[in-house]
Every structure is written in C-alpha cells, then in structure tokens.
C-alpha cells in the first residue's frame, strides 16, 4: 500500500531513507534539457524475494535534442553534491542498508538524472531527519518518521526534531564552558541525526537505537 502523503516537512531539516521497502517506486526524472528515452521506464520499483531485494527497471535519459540513448554512468562529484539524495554524512547512521531484509539500497545514479529524486513510499517505510548546515538539534538520538496505516488511511508519524540556529552566542562573560554529555556528542554538529521530540520525551530505550523518550508511549 502506497503512502498517501510525503513525509512531514520539519523546519531547517532534511530527511533520508536508509533503505527502501519493497514496493517503493522511484520516478525516472531527467534534468533540464533531457528526457526519458522512448519506451523507457517511468519508474524503478523495489522488488524481491525473502533473501534478496533489488530495483526493477532502469532509468535512462537522453538529450531532448537527439534520439540517441545514453548509457548509465555515475555523475561527476560536483553533480552528485547537488542531488538531494546523496548519503547524509551522519555520525550515527541508524540502519545498515544491506542488513534489512525486504529492503532495497539507494539506487545508483543515472546519467543526466534530475537533481531531486521523487520516491513513492509504502506503508512501513521509515525515514530519518537531520538538521541542515548551520542548525543544531536540541535533543539527541535519531529523529524518524514512519508511514503507518490507521483506520484505512496512511499517515506519517511526527519526528519532532527541533533544529535551532546558531545566531546567538551561548556564553555570557564569566559563564562556564558547556559540558559535554557523558556518552559523548556526535562528531559533526552540522549533521545532527538527532532528536526525539519536540515536545515528547520517551521512556528509556536501548543505546543501540537512541530514539525519543515518549514517542512510543504517545503514538
């Protein structure tokens, strides 16, 4: 079952799926000046059996000015940088993509791919949020949203990530230096895959999956 809506938008944050559930579709979109090849796939589909999942179909783009098809190649580094779906450099990636049965990895890029990927997620899909550069998370632990089916309708759970700007200096004259938490803080402040709730703290969870205090109780 496809999710009706996109994952929630959180101010000053972006989301990323670490792996894609079987049934997920990825539109074959081309960048400006290019189009899908004739008879080319409209989308890629994550399919599989109990032991292996992979993307069916291949996306291919050709110049709008020519009929020749183009072969699939990895984009140049600078091209890859602007794509929204490149891996988030997170200090604590919650999921090892390869280890999740029934899930596909991030599909490799194709030549002249559009700068933004459009996915159609299915029920049970989880996405993770992180603060954009220049913002930091108020809380620690992954902020996630899951597409759930309730009363015959799909909805995404609220990740509750709060990303605050760094406009204000945190010290007043004579104020003590901030003390790091005993567990240590994430290496990179700009990639805070962290939170729990805006307004929700959750009951203690295993350190392997640091999620928020009360979401489990509330949702």
């Amino acid at each position: 079952e496809l999710c009706d809506d996109d994952p929630p938008e959180i101010p000053h944050a972006t989301f990323k799926a670490m792996a894609y559930k079987e049934g997920t579709m990825l539109n074959c979109e081309c960048k400006r000046g290019f189009r899908r090849i004739k008879s080319g796939s409209l989308y890629m589909l994550c399919t599989g059996n109990s032991s292996h999942s992979s993307w069916d179909n291949q996306c291919q783009c050709t110049s709008s000015a020519t009929r020749n098809t183009t072969k699939q190649v990895t984009p140049q580094p600078e091209e890859q940088k602007e794509r929204k779906t490149t891996e988030m450099q997170s200090p604590m990636q919650p999921v090892d993509q390869a280890s999740l049965p029934g899930h596909c990895r991030e599909p490799p890029p194709w030549e002249n791919e559009a700068t933004e990927r459009i996915y159609h997620f299915v029920v049970g899909q989880m996405v993770y949020y992180q603060c954009v550069q220049g913002y930091r998370a108020l809380h620690r632990g992954p902020a996630e949203s899951v597409c759930k089916m309730t009363h015959g309708k799909t909805r995404w759970t609220q990740p509750q990530l709060i990303c605050t700007g760094e406009m204000e200096t945190s010290q007043f004259p004579g104020e003590e230096k901030p003390q790091a938490s005993p567990e240590g803080r994430p290496e990179s402040e700009t990639s805070c895959l962290v939170t729990t709730t805006d307004f929700q703290i959750q009951t203690e969870m295993a350190a392997t999956m640091e999620t928020s205090i009360f979401t489990t109780e509330y949702q």
Partner: antibody, heavy 114, light 111 residues
Framework: EVQLLESGGGLVQPGGSLRLSCAAS????????MHWVRQAPGKGLEWVSV????????YYADSVKGRFTISRDNSKNTLYLQMNSLRAEDTAVYYC???????WGQGTLVTVSS | QSVLTQPPSASGTPGQRVTISCTGS?????????VHWYQQLPGTAPKLLIY???ERPSGVPDRFSGSKSGTSASLAISGLRSEDEADYYC???????????FGGGTKLTVL
Amino acid sequence: EVQLLESGGGLVQPGGSLRLSCAASGFTFSWYGMHWVRQAPGKGLEWVSVISYDGSYKYYADSVKGRFTISRDNSKNTLYLQMNSLRAEDTAVYYCAAGVPDYWGQGTLVTVSS
Amino acid sequence: QSVLTQPPSASGTPGQRVTISCTGSSSNIGAGYDVHWYQQLPGTAPKLLIYSNNERPSGVPDRFSGSKSGTSASLAISGLRSEDEADYYCAAWDDSLNGPVFGGGTKLTVL
C-alpha cells in the same frame, strides 16, 4: 516514571541572586534539551531559557538576557538556573521542563520583594 | 504580550463542544512548527494535552482534539465535563526566539 523536582526558590531582595536546581529522573537526561518556564501570579506561562542536550548552546528570553544563566550537569542529571540582579517582575513560579516542553516539574516559587 | 494569541476566556455547558483558537505568525506556527496544547488545573503544573497539532498522549481522552492550518491552530473539547474547567495554553517553537512561545492562555468555564 519521569520526575522533575525543582528547588532553590524563596524570598530575595531586588538586586539579589538565587540559584534554582532541577533534579531529573526516569529518562536519559543527557539526551534532551531542557527549559525553564515561569508563571507570575495570576498570569500565563513565559519561557525563560533553553539548553541543548549537551550544554553546547543556550538561549534566553529578552527579559532575562544578561541576568540569568542556564546550565546543566549531565553526570548529576541536574539542570540549573543562576538568577542575578533580580527584579520585582521576576516574581513567579519557576518550572523546569524536559523536551520542549512536555514534562514539567511542580515548580518553585521565587519572590523578589524588599 | 504573548506571541501566540488565544481568547482569554471560553465557556460551555456540560456535554457541549468548545473550541479554543491559537494564532501565531510566520516565525512559529507558520514556519511549520507543530502546535502543542497544555491543560493547567488550578494550583498545578501544566500538563501536555495535545502534541504535534493533533496527537494525544496516552491517558488523554479522545474528547480532546487539535488541528492546525497556516498560522493558526485550534483545540476542540467535545462532551464538556466539569473537570475540564482549567486554563489551556497553546505553544510552538519560534525561530526568532530560538525557544518555545506560549499563548496567553484561555480560561475555560463549565457553566
């Protein structure tokens, strides 16, 4: 069970100082941003200050900026508010709150009067 | 003056449905931040009633519901009961403050 217990309130003269403490239990304190919110007698809620989970950044309401300092000791599961240059208008019940904020302590009364 | 605007009072008779509004701006509700509602019974600390616009913590009856649209939000209480008499506050994160902002509170009277 999540518990937040404030202490340190009392009567103080204008220009004086107080240090409030908030002892937290029932959750992993070092994962969460913490707040101080106050409520003057018969008035609404007013946010005072926030500190991030690791103490690396802090923000203050304009009304207390330069006079109040928020801090935390994650090894003691305790949140603090150092209040200097107190004014009559700082008289309020001060609540410690976890998250942003969903769990609240019962509050401690600060009275600034001569 | 509060950053979020609420009516100072509201009232209803037992069994009635009452709605409390909360209006913000482009730096808080309009920026995409969730709205949260608190109930404060006389002489007690605020208690989270609705989080993330329309979600109820466990233990909160389904008579309470929330919604959000644009720069505004509202709390609806159906099947009003005498124990619902309390002060109700809305709150949301605010970018310009880097902290949560609260409404001025609405005193609900059950007639």
